[in-house]
């Protein structure tokens, strides 16, 4: 019994290696490779319903090399675990589990979410956005001028997209009424809307002042009163008493 | 047939270095890998470590502070030293061989050798 | 360090009966498993590695199977020298361990 054996385990030796196969240090023909030459690693291949032994120059998914003085080996990952780096820590995770700290998990812990991009846990992501930029022009039906009512927009942007987690984000537009001093409009702008289309020639007193930006058109609520003459005067205070209305829209 | 003999001192004083050898015929050291067992009376057994082909060792950390395997080819010879011995060394150490993770595992086995720790 | 528990620790049984033995590790060993018989005052003897290969002059009636943590050894009909105490080793990462063996006495 133990002769047979050893006869059999004399042709493993290294030194008596003919017949094995590339990386083989010793083989036997039922098991295919027994050890590996250094630096390669061991692994059991299955073949049919048989495992052989074959030794490889890196591990397959699901498998990391261990090295121990004089002998390799592909060990495998945890269950959970497609890739890893050892058996400890996972750098990829099966299906259906999120990776967090080399961990494997069903569901990612407090203060973190899913990623089921990347299946990570990933920290929540809130929504960041810009300071407001300046009130539009004040404008009706897209013009500045023949008109005293109309809207002004401002407008801001998103910094950072929130993830599914994360808070929404604010409104990034708002409108609100808008009122300023009634004013023809100049020649580039007639003719535009309505009755004004068929006019050719400008009128006597139309104001050849260039639209105002919109940093007067914000202060347009409170124009000094040595900007305007008397008869305009009038007409503000009238303006004055109907306070200004703001709309958001939200993204 | 491979053939693994183990001997050294059946009785070692607490505190001193346990010392034992494995005589190995019928194979040669520089191939496969050698291995020092032990088994406490009535108990189970427990992995110490080996020496390989080339002479590179592994040891359990469980021992690794007090563990020494070393080996002498020109007489086919590896040893053991197990430092600071205590009663809870008190064994039976086999010495045994394995070719590769492809092939059985402890395929020759010594005879064993019982070490009691006393004073 | 990888543990292996095996069970049960001791068993009765007569000639002719089949006895299960088994072992579980405390994580996936993916075959990499041996199971030795040990008869008092003697080495133990390897009986079968890599979970169900038989070493060679080794009975048939002696069997392994299982995979990930989960292994069996199976006598199909236990003769009166398969009476001795039965250890199943892991192999698959260092320090290798052993289970806490299983003692097969006469019924």
């Known amino acids: 019994q133990n002769a047979s054996r050893g006869r059999r385990q004399r042709r493993m030796h290294p030194n008596v290696s003919q017949g094995c196969q590339g990386g083989c240090a010793t083989c036997s023909d039922y098991n295919g490779c027994l050890s590996c030459k250094p630096r390669l690693f061991f692994a059991l291949e299955r073949i049919g319903m048989k495992q052989i032994g074959v030794c490889l120059s890196s591990c397959p998914s699901g498998y990391y090399g261990t090295r121990y003085p004089d002998i390799n080996k592909c060990t495998k990952c945890k269950a959970d675990c497609d890739t890893c780096f050892n058996k400890n820590f996972c750098t990829k995770c099966k299906s259906g589990f999120y990776l967090h700290l080399g961990k494997c998990l069903d569901n990612c812990p407090e203060g973190l979410e899913a990623n089921n991009h990347t299946m990570e846990c990933v920290s929540i992501v809130h929504c960041e956005v810009s300071e407001w930029n300046p009130w539009s022009p004040c404008t009706k039906k897209g013009k500045t001028c023949g008109f005293k009512r109309g809207t002004e927009t401002r407008v801001r942007e998103i910094i950072q997209h929130p993830s599914a987690k994360g808070n929404l984000c604010p409104p990034t537009n708002e409108t609100r009424k808008c009122t300023v001093q009634r004013k023809k409009c100049q020649k580039g702008e007639r003719g535009k809307k309505g009755r004004e289309r068929k006019r050719k020639k400008p009128n006597k007193g139309e104001s050849k002042e260039a639209i105002p930006d919109s940093k007067s058109l914000e202060s347009s609520k409170e124009i000094p009163e040595q900007r305007e003459n008397k008869q305009q005067q009038k007409k503000r205070k009238v303006q004055d008493k109907q306070k200004s209305v703001s709309v958001s829209t939200v993204h | 047939e491979v053939q693994l003999v183990e001997s050294g001192p059946g009785l070692v004083k607490p505190s001193e270095t346990l010392s034992l050898t494995c005589t190995v015929s019928?194979?040669?050291?520089?191939?496969?890998?050698w291995n020092w067992i032990r088994q406490p009376p009535g108990k189970g057994l427990e992995y110490m470590g080996y020496?390989?082909?080339?002479?590179?060792?592994y040891q359990n950390p469980s021992l690794k502070s007090r563990i020494t395997i070393s080996r002498d080819t020109s007489k086919n010879q590896y040893s053991l030293k197990l430092s600071s011995v205590t009663a809870a060394d008190t064994a039976v150490y086999y010495c045994?061989?394995?070719?590769?993770?492809?092939?059985?595992?402890?395929?020759?086995w010594g005879q064993g050798t019982l070490v009691t720790v006393s004073s | 360090d990888i543990q292996m528990t095996q069970s049960p620790s001791s068993l009765s049984a007569s000639v002719g009966d089949r006895v299960t033995i088994t072992c579980k590790a405390s994580?996936?060993?993916?075959?990499?498993l041996s199971w030795f018989q040990q008869k008092p005052g003697k080495a133990p003897k390897t009986l079968i590695y890599?979970?169900?290969r038989l070493v060679d002059g080794v009975p048939s009636r002696f069997s392994g199977s299982g995979s990930g943590q989960d292994y069996t050894l199976t006598i199909s009909s236990l003769q009166p020298e398969d009476f001795a105490t039965y250890y199943c080793?892991?192999?698959?990462?260092?320090?290798?361990?052993f289970g806490q063996g299983t003692k097969v006495e006469i019924k």
């Open positions: 045994a061989t394995y070719y590769g993770y492809g092939g059985p595992w402890f395929a020759y």
């Open positions: 019928g194979d040669s050291i520089t191939s496969g890998y």
């Open positions: 020496i390989s082909y080339s002479g590179k060792t």
């Open positions: 994580q996936d060993i993916d075959s990499y």
């Open positions: 890599l979970t169900n």
């Open positions: 080793l892991h192999y698959d990462e260092f320090p290798l361990t």
